[in-house]
């Protein structure tokens, strides 16, 4: 619940907020979970903590990992985890699905596309906007503060929109880009190639040995009733039923949910009494429908209990 996925591109700025909230007066300590090493607060460091924010200026692929934040008050401590993944820049125009922020839908009356995470940064207008890597031109596109407005939305406006802005920190400028898909609402339903919302690709989930753990595979498939959409788990490339470990079971049936008007399915994998050998397995979340199949992988790591108060 108090873990958050964050991602960015190498050589860009990335700012991550602690998933545990507190009053501004509370102190927040940040640690690199794997080593339990404290993150410095001095701004001369490339990676430094600034209250509730963890700043990578700029980010490097080697920064990927789980960061722990502890919000300290006189009466309690609250612990949160930021799972940060920094990716290499793609050589081609395609933005892979693991770099995408949540899909937004628009219609003729409402076609705002907000630039994801921009409120975390110190930026000044105007924003630059691109669709499928092409700079947006023409009077139909209007950049307003932190969002883009498209006039007279048409189905052809659907696609991947990237916002680009500059973060300023103590006089130094850092580039930031963020991409999300925009779909055009239609009264009729439609289906899409599966989009896995959770887990993030190559996610590391922290678990405690001897305790129970749940993994959720969640994917969206389009709008309206979806025909032959499914999500499921595999262990080391094998169906759960064929793997033969009774402690690891897939929930019966798939839960339907809706996210931004899209039809989504969830499948929970329950691991009872987590054992050391479970950390060696690869857990694959598969999403498939009539358009195709996509998979994301999760591995488990042993939780490093820093905070016994929360």
């Amino acid at each position: 619940k108090f873990s958050k996925q964050s991602w960015g591109l190498e050589n860009e700025a990335l700012i991550v907020r602690c998933p545990r909230q507190g009053k501004p007066s509370y102190t927040v300590d940040w640690y690199y979970s794997q080593t339990n090493k404290s993150i410095p607060t001095q701004e001369r460091n490339r990676v430094f903590a600034s209250g509730q924010l963890l700043k990578f200026l700029p980010a490097a692929v080697a920064d990927s990992g789980i960061y722990t934040c502890i919000v300290r008050s006189p009466t309690f401590n609250r612990t949160g985890y930021a799972n940060v993944t920094i990716y290499k820049k793609q050589s081609d125009c395609n933005v892979p699905d693991y770099l995408m922020y949540s899909t937004v839908s628009g219609s003729e009356k409402n076609s705002k596309i907000y630039c994801p995470t921009i409120d975390l940064y110190n930026w000044t207008a105007p924003l630059e906007w691109f669709k499928n890597c092409q700079a947006l031109q023409g009077s139909r596109y209007r950049a307003h503060k932190s969002f883009l407005v498209i006039d007279n939305v048409m189905t052809e406006d659907a696609g991947d929109y990237t916002c680009k802005f500059i973060h300023n920190e103590n006089g130094a400028n850092y580039s930031v880009t963020a991409t999300r898909s925009f779909t055009v609402k239609d009264e009729q339903g439609f289906s899409l190639f599966p989009v896995i919302g959770a887990p993030a690709q190559n996610e590391i989930k922290e678990v405690e040995i001897g305790k129970n753990a749940n993994l959720t595979c969640s994917a969206c498939f389009g709008k309206g009733t979806q025909f032959l959409a499914a999500v499921l788990w595999q262990l080391n490339g094998t169906k759960i039923t064929d793997f033969g470990e009774p402690r690891i079971q897939q929930e019966e049936g798939q839960n339907q949910s809706f996210s931004n008007g899209l039809a989504c399915l969830d499948m929970v994998l329950r691991i009872a009494d987590v054992k050391e050998e479970d950390l060696l397995l690869q857990y694959d979340c598969l999403a498939l429908n009539l358009h195709g199949l996509r998979r994301h992988t999760v591995r488990l790591s042993r939780k490093n209990p820093i905070d016994h108060h929360s």
């Epitope: 690709q201 490339g237 998979r295």
Partner: antibody, heavy 119, light 107 residues
Framework: EVQLLESGGGLVKPGGSLRLSCAAS????????MSWVRQAPGKGLEWVSS????????YYADSVKGRFTISRDDSKNTLYLQMNSLKTEDTAVYYC????????????WGQGTLVTVSS | DIQMTQSPSSLSASVGDRVTITCQAS??????LNWYQQKPGKAPKLLIY???TLQSGVPSRFSGSGSGTDFTLTISSLQPEDFATYYC?????????FGPGTKVDIK
């Protein structure tokens, strides 16, 4: 022993049709996804199509979508590829392959059957 | 679609040599990467799946490594029967795609 045996290849004119078959033995055919992969003369491998064990899911490469249809008959342990509106660029050896792990990888392959599209 | 590239496209080596072939995906594919060997006039044969797991019956001189976008197939000591063409293939998402192949021939 797992065996896959393709048949049905031959010479056909552009615009013509052909139906390939793949007879499977040595495993529980209905439990596996099955695929067709082709190889043009002197070229690399190209995935063509796959079908799930339940026949619910059928996927195609863009180059054959709308022209080729994959199907299976579990009672006969046979995989099929119906090829219509054939083009010269469809000339290739067509392999049938068994999938592991929901299109994870191809662990067994047939010996292939040659399809030649020429006028 | 995910594009796969391989290098080199061909190489000449001697029996006993250590041979390394690389495969690169156009986007992140975790470890959903498989390697196949194909000899002239024959069907491909699975060598390695999941980037590094050796298929049953494949000699241990073959090994695979890598994750994300960059992968490697290594033959620690080339044997006469290893002269063939090697293909990588991604299975992260459809359409499934193969690399163009690397031909290993006798020096």
């Amino acid at each position: 022993e797992v065996q896959l045996l393709e048949s049905g290849g031959g010479l056909v004119k552009p615009g013509g049709s052909l139906r390939l078959s793949c007879a499977a033995s040595g495993f529980t055919f209905s439990s596996y996804w099955m695929s067709w992969v082709r190889q043009a003369p002197g070229k690399g491998l190209e995935w063509v199509s796959s079908i799930s064990g339940t026949s619910n899911y059928m996927y195609y490469a863009d180059s054959v979508k709308g022209r080729f249809t994959i199907s299976r008959d579990d009672s006969k342990n046979t995989l099929y590829l119906q090829m219509n509106s054939l083009k010269t660029e469809d000339t290739a050896v067509y392999y049938c392959a068994r999938d592991r792990g929901f299109l994870g990888y191809f662990d067994y392959w047939g010996q292939g059957t040659l399809v030649t599209v020429s006028s | 679609d995910i594009q796969m590239t391989q290098s080199p496209s061909s190489l000449s080596a001697s029996v006993g040599d250590r041979v390394t072939i690389t495969c690169q995906a156009s986007q992140y594919i975790s470890n959903y990467l498989n390697w196949y060997q194909q000899k002239p006039g024959k069907a491909p044969k699975l060598l390695i799946y999941g980037a590094s797991t050796l298929q049953s019956g494949v000699p241990s001189r073959f090994s695979g490594s890598g994750s994300g976008t960059d992968f490697t197939l290594t033959i620690s000591s080339l044997q006469p029967e290893d002269f063939a063409t090697y293909y990588c293939q991604q299975s992260q998402s459809t359409p499934l795609t193969f690399g163009p192949g690397t031909k290993v021939d006798i020096k």
